[in-house]
Interface confidence: low
């Protein structure tokens, strides 16, 4: 059998095979050792018994999408049946004090591979044995502690495979410089040690995407905005836009990144090198927000100039830095293999990312202030609680509810929260009466809200002792 017979039905075209060379990967035309690594089809009854105590689940994730030229990292995590875990020696053991469906196991081991690997018969003087090999016959790398690595992972994509010895989780990074743009499929098959052979325990696949567009996300935040995810914001208050570029392999770390904003409200283009920007909309309505991100990224080099005439001496090839746009016809897409063969060249290419959103601007509560606090006189006998009136003003739209959160002086430990509807006139002046249990210092958070906004103010308040012999102290601020 060949690797492609074992690892999946996706058969890339000859062009794809030629142009998607992954560094360190091998062609899936190679032979697969079926004696050491048996191959089971889906639905084969042997899968049922491939693992003691249940099925192992493999979870494959990647940090896709990847900007072409950057590294994409794939991670595989094995999830064992309940109550099983891998110990420090790479053996699979039952968790202590963890009861599974079969009850507590007297034997702490699900698989005790250490005992087997210490019995190293069949090895020659180099410490290499005929069974410590990958499916293509390559020997296992002898890293320190390699005997504790009891899982064999075979990654397969674009007509190539990569083999890795590991524990219950592994990571593999692939450079995407030679990968065709668009969605691609990664498949992983996992084997475990079984005596002097291996048994398949899990198969998993996941789609990853390689793109020439910078993956861009924008978060939007505005003080007093009630729901930051609904793309509805308030008039006359700044919105903070924060651009997040998905670049997990730090491919653009040394790139100058430019951000070109159009806020859709006839304020013109705004160009910046800062990933955050503030903008205030002064009119209600619906606006189209557009962002273009531009970065000079490492990229394929354009074809070299024709060689000089023989009569002239050949110039030395110094390292050069060239730059051109990714939408320039020709070099970027023509023949990436040819382009990357120029020695000692370090070329750059402008990459772009785009973000568009429709945002709605509405009236909202812009500000809230406590202008007066009054201790309400209580009749005798003196109760243990105090009543305090807060006189509050606001600006902007008219609130429909008021909430007070009373907490300790650090404003961290909430003692009580009260919310109630309010009916406020155009002047936006209201009185909020709240009860305080006992004397002391309190933190009071007061919020006024309507459908779209929530404005907050805070104050520290000192409630005096209730001493019948002394007059009540009125607290104003």
């Amino acid at each position: 059998k060949r690797f492609h017979d074992v690892l999946g039905n996706e058969r890339p075209s000859a062009y794809m095979r030629e142009h998607n060379q992954l560094n360190g990967w091998s062609s899936d035309e190679n032979d697969w050792n079926e004696k050491l690594y048996p191959v089971w089809k889906r639905g084969d009854m042997r899968w049922k018994n491939s693992w003691k105590g249940g099925r192992v689940q493999a979870v494959l994730t990647s940090d896709s999408p990847a900007l072409v030229g950057s590294n994409i990292t794939f991670a595989v995590n094995l999830i064992f049946p309940r109550c099983q875990k891998e110990d420090a020696n790479g053996n699979i053991v039952y968790e202590k004090n963890c009861r599974n469906e079969a009850g507590l196991s007297a034997d702490p081991y699900v698989y005790n591979w250490t005992a087997w690997s210490e019995d190293s018969d069949g090895e020659n003087g180099t410490g290499q044995s005929h069974h410590n090999v990958f499916p293509d016959g390559k020997p296992f790398p002898h890293h320190p502690g390699w005997r504790r690595w009891n899982f064999i992972y075979v990654f397969h994509t674009l007509g190539q495979y990569f083999q890795k010895l590991g524990r219950c989780s592994v990571r593999v990074s692939v450079n995407t410089a030679n990968v065709t743009l668009g969605p691609q499929l990664m498949e992983v098959t996992v084997y475990r040690r079984h005596g002097r052979a291996y048994v398949p325990i899990a198969q998993v696949k996941d789609v990853y995407v390689v793109t020439d567009q910078i993956p861009v996300f924008v978060t939007m935040f505005q003080k007093n905005d009630r729901n930051s995810s609904d793309e509805t914001f308030l008039k006359d208050l700044p919105i903070m836009f924060d651009v997040l570029i998905h670049d997990p392999s730090h491919f653009l770390n040394y790139s100058t990144i430019n951000y070109k904003w159009s806020f859709g409200d006839n304020t013109g283009l705004f160009v910046s090198t800062n990933h955050t920007v503030n903008h205030t909309y002064v009119l209600n309505g619906t606006f189209s927000l557009n962002l273009t991100v531009k970065a000079a990224a490492p990229g394929p080099c354009p074809p070299p100039p024709p060689p000089p005439r023989p009569s002239k001496p050949t110039p030395s090839l110094a390292t050069t830095l060239k730059s051109y746009d990714s939408n320039t016809p020709g070099p970027a897409g023509d023949n990436p293999l040819e382009l990357s063969r120029i020695p000692d060249e370090n070329c750059q290419i402008n990459r772009y990312g785009h973000f568009q959103a429709t945002i709605t601007i509405v009236e909202g509560i812009l500000e809230v202030n406590i202008i007066q606090m009054t201790d309400v006189l209580m009749p005798v006998p003196w109760p243990e609680s105090s009543l305090i009136d807060f006189v509050v003003t606001c600006q902007g739209s008219i609130p429909t509810e008021v909430c007070t959160i009373i907490s300790d002086p650090t404003c961290e430990i909430t003692q009580n929260t009260v919310c109630s509807p309010v009916d406020v006139d155009e002047m936006c002046l209201l009185t909020v009466r709240r009860t305080f249990n006992g004397s002391g210092t309190y933190c009071v958070n007061l919020t006024l809200g309507d459908d779209t906004s929530l404005a907050l103010t805070s104050t520290l308040i000192s409630v005096p002792d209730r001493d019948p012999a002394s007059p009540l102290r009125m607290a104003n601020s």
């Epitope: 309940r82 110990d87 420090a88 202590k96 004090n97 963890c98 009861r99």
Partner: antibody
Framework: EVQLVESGGGSVRPGRSLKLSCAAA????????MTWVRQAPTKGLEWVAS????????YYRDSVKGRFTISRDNARSSLYLQMDSLRSEDTGTYYC???????WGQGVMVTVSS | DIQMTQSPASLSASLGETVSIECLAS??????LTWYQQKPGKSPQVLIY???GLQDGVPSRFSGSGSGRQYSLKINGLESEDAATYFC?????????FGSGTKLEIK
């Protein structure tokens, strides 16, 4: 977003009982072992009890064995700690956490004093 | 029961410095060790899991290492927000046990 919200704390006299509850949201509650951890005022953290996924396995620190009962209701995504025969040394903030403290609630105060 | 001995109990260091906190288990805990940060009045937060795994969202200046019985938390380039108490927890077997804590003060 994972949320764990404890309730049921308060002040009681020694020998009395309290029942703490923890409401979970934002994750598949039945997939997780759950744990109660406590912290006496200005002191360190102390594991109290844990329970496995389906409630069939419960584990307690020696000083609370026979007095405290940990339980769960997976249908309601809730964790409970029934505390009987309370002692002054049980005073502290009680936190509900997933297994070994991956996510934590905000804590609830229990005061035991005469 | 597994005892976790954490040292030092307190630590004072300047901004930008590098500090280490140690936890010693009374027996092999097979990397089942978690480090937490706790600020006054707040719940603990996971920094490092499985001895060396950096929890999502935790700055890379935090790192964990160790195996067997001995583990350490290292903070490179201290920042003012790192002032807190740090705890280790062994999750190898019941009863789960915490270290006694290290209070880190920024000078």
């Amino acid at each position: 977003e994972v949320q764990l919200v404890e309730s049921g704390g308060g002040s009681v006299r020694p020998g009395r009982s309290l029942k703490l509850s923890c409401a979970a949201a934002g994750f598949t509650f039945s997939d997780y072992y759950m744990t109660w951890v406590r912290q006496a005022p200005t002191k360190g953290l102390e594991w109290v009890a844990s329970i496995n996924h389906d409630g069939g396995g419960t584990y307690y620190r020696d000083s609370v064995k026979g007095r405290f009962t940990i339980s769960r209701d997976n249908a309601r995504s809730s964790l409970y700690l029934q505390m009987d025969s309370l002692r002054s040394e049980d005073t502290g903030t009680y936190y509900c956490t997933t297994r070994a403290g991956w996510h934590w609630g905000q804590g609830v105060m229990v005061t035991v004093s005469s | 029961d597994i005892q976790m001995t954490q040292s030092p109990a307190s630590l004072s260091a300047s901004l930008g410095e590098t500090v280490s906190i140690e936890c010693l288990a009374s027996e092999d805990i097979y990397n089942y060790l978690t480090w937490y940060q706790q600020k006054p009045g707040k719940s603990p937060q996971v920094l490092i899991y499985s001895a060396s795994g950096l929890q999502d969202g935790v700055p890379s200046r935090f790192s964990g290492s160790g195996s067997g019985r001995q583990y350490s938390l290292k903070i490179n380039g201290l920042e003012s927000e790192d002032a807190a108490t740090y705890f280790c927890l062994q999750d190898s077997e019941y009863p789960l046990t915490f270290g006694s804590g290290t209070k880190l003060e920024i000078k």
